[in-house]
């Protein structure tokens, strides 16, 4: 987790002088509780947005937006703590909005936004906005939390972000797999424009099961420049096992930008349809 660039982040708006500060996620009001605290945020919304760094790289960011409740507690609102928690790693990053002037009611509901938390493809987050100061130990909570799921690099908008392109998202191998006679599979795919090797991983399964009955790995050497974007054809020999008929072919590239961690593409060949077995004819004809 990180913030997009380190340029000056602003939270000021007409009628409010505000500054964005780094936060330890442990606001002072936890340690020194106040008697009067503001109510919780209203209508917290998290959306996937995309933003360029000063270097021109494109990153997915969490766009956080919320409004204030129209009650008198607005008079005691000194700011907000924004926290993003990556659910799997338990890594948390916080920033603090510090209000440098008192809020006053005006004709429109106060609305705040922040779009500088960089998020990772295919990751899950919990976003929390805490109004400051935080409540006394037994006080009503004054925060709101929402979960946020970032799509993976297959997602159209994600595909062109810097982290996805670094893992090979622009390569479309257009895999085709056909079953040949004599227990063979012909795998065909389009090579990318990089002189790097590939690996084909074949896993076979029985018709209705998820336990593999055959596994095979095939190495494809790095293509020459004249072979870039051309089709590569490979014939794989299957083990002659009855019922081991569902085949998953996975192609793993080793691009220089992602090495062992590049996006893999796969295709599956289903078992052939079994013809419906005819009803057995009874040995005798019933009389009714």
């Amino acid at each position: 987790l990180r913030l997009l660039d380190h340029r000056a982040l602003v939270c000021s708006q007409p009628g409010l002088n505000c500054t964005v500060k780094n936060s330890t996620c442990l606001d002072d009001s936890w340690i020194h509780p106040r008697n009067l605290t503001p109510s919780s945020p209203k209508d917290l919304q998290i959306q996937l947005h995309f933003a360029h760094t000063q270097q021109g790289d494109l990153f997915p960011v969490a766009h956080i937006e919320w409004t204030l409740q129209t009650d008198a507690s607005i008079l005691y609102l000194e700011g907000a703590e924004l926290s993003v928690l990556q659910l799997n790693t338990n890594e948390r990053l916080c920033v603090r909005f510090e209000f440098l002037s008192k809020l006053r009611h005006h004709h429109r509901r106060w609305r705040f936004t922040f779009s500088h938390f960089v998020v990772d493809p295919d990751q899950e987050y919990e976003v929390t906005v805490h109004h400051l100061p935080k409540p006394i130990p037994d006080g009503d909570p004054n925060h709101q939390s929402k979960n946020f799921l970032v799509p993976d690099c297959e997602h159209a908008r994600m595909k062109v972000t810097t982290p996805c392109m670094s893992s090979g998202s622009l390569w479309d191998p257009n895999i085709t797999v056909e079953t040949l006679e004599a227990h063979q599979l012909r795998v065909s795919f389009t090579l990318w424009n990089e002189s790097t090797h590939y690996q084909i991983l074949l896993t076979s399964f029985p018709h209705m099961e998820n336990h593999s009955c055959f596994e095979h790995m095939h190495h494809i050497p790095a293509p020459r420049p004249e072979e870039f974007h051309q089709r590569s054809n490979v014939t794989l020999t299957l083990r002659n096992l009855k019922g081991c008929c569902r085949h998953q072919v996975q192609i793993q590239p080793f691009f220089s930008s992602c090495l062992n961690d590049c996006l893999r593409h796969s295709a599956t060949v289903s078992c052939p349809e079994m013809p419906d077995t005819p009803e057995p004819i009874p040995d005798y004809m019933p009389l009714w």
């Epitope: 799997n88 899950e124 979960n147 799921l149």
Partner: antibody
Framework: QVQLVQSGAEVKKPGASVKVSCKAS????????ISWVRQAPGQGLEWMGW????????KYAQKFQGRVTMTTDTSTSTAYMELRSLRSDDTAVYYC?????????WGQGTLVTVSS | EIVMTQSPATLSVSPGERATLSCRAS??????LAWYQQKPGQAPRLLIY???TRATGIPARFSDNGSGTEFTLTISSLQSEDFAVYFC?????????FGGGTKVEIK
């Protein structure tokens, strides 16, 4: 091929405990969380909680708080869910699933029958 | 907690026809909705998340429309393998909650 393979069916007496295992393969266990969901016979799905194998962090549904413990063993790529003080209404198929929000791969399920 | 309500409980459709399944949340969940398919004796399978993103390997005939509180799963042309029970699930806030399911059966 991502796979989650669960332990076999269990029959337990009321008041006993059950521990269901879920072995992950085809990916690194620490890359994603593991959620547990149960389904009573003929009923819908009920979320029980999740564990992060990376951090050990857990989140349990309030209904199961104090009665459920989720753990992982990264050396064997296995997640465990233990439910204590079993009652007859805990009879259900218990599923493990990958991830914490939208659950993309599921185990085959483990039927736990609680009967005296 | 957020209550998810699915309708109808059972939907009878002929193969090749369009099926429309409804899911309503008791409060706004933005686009934080997933759809699952479950066949008898099998575990659920993720179809759609983010209210509109198809999971890996899910055919284009499955699509979702909606955000906020009203969502619709559409199966444009039912195939024989699509007859199953479908569940919606919100992941906007804890606890995660599921709808009661819609059974799609052959007419």
């Amino acid at each position: 091929q991502v796979q989650l393979v669960q332990s076999g069916a269990e029959v337990k007496k009321p008041g006993a405990s059950v521990k269901v295992s879920c072995k992950a393969s085809g990916y690194t266990l620490t890359s994603y969380g593991i959620s547990w969901v149960r389904q009573a016979p003929g009923q819908g799905l009920e979320w029980m909680g999740w564990i992060s194998a990376y951090s050990g962090n857990t989140k349990y549904a309030q209904k199961f708080q104090g009665r459920v413990t989720m753990t992982t063993d990264t050396s064997t790529s296995t997640a465990y869910m233990e439910l204590r003080s079993l009652r007859s209404d805990d009879t259900a198929v218990y599923y493990c699933a990958r991830r914490q929000l939208a659950l993309d791969y599921w185990g085959q399920g483990t039927l736990v029958t609680v009967s005296s | 907690e957020i209550v998810m309500t699915q309708s109808p409980a059972t939907l009878s459709v002929s193969p090749g026809e369009r099926a429309t399944l409804s899911c309503r949340a008791s409060q706004s969940i933005s686009s934080n909705l997933a759809w699952y398919q479950q066949k008898p004796g099998q575990a659920p399978r993720l179809l759609i998340y983010g209210a509109s993103t198809r999971a890996t390997g899910i055919p284009a005939r499955f699509s979702d429309n909606g955000s906020g509180t009203e969502f619709t799963l559409t199966i444009s042309s039912l195939q024989s393998e699509d007859f199953a029970v479908y569940f919606c699930q919100q992941y906007d806030t804890w606890p995660l909650t599921f709808g009661g399911g819609t059974k799609v059966e052959i007419k």
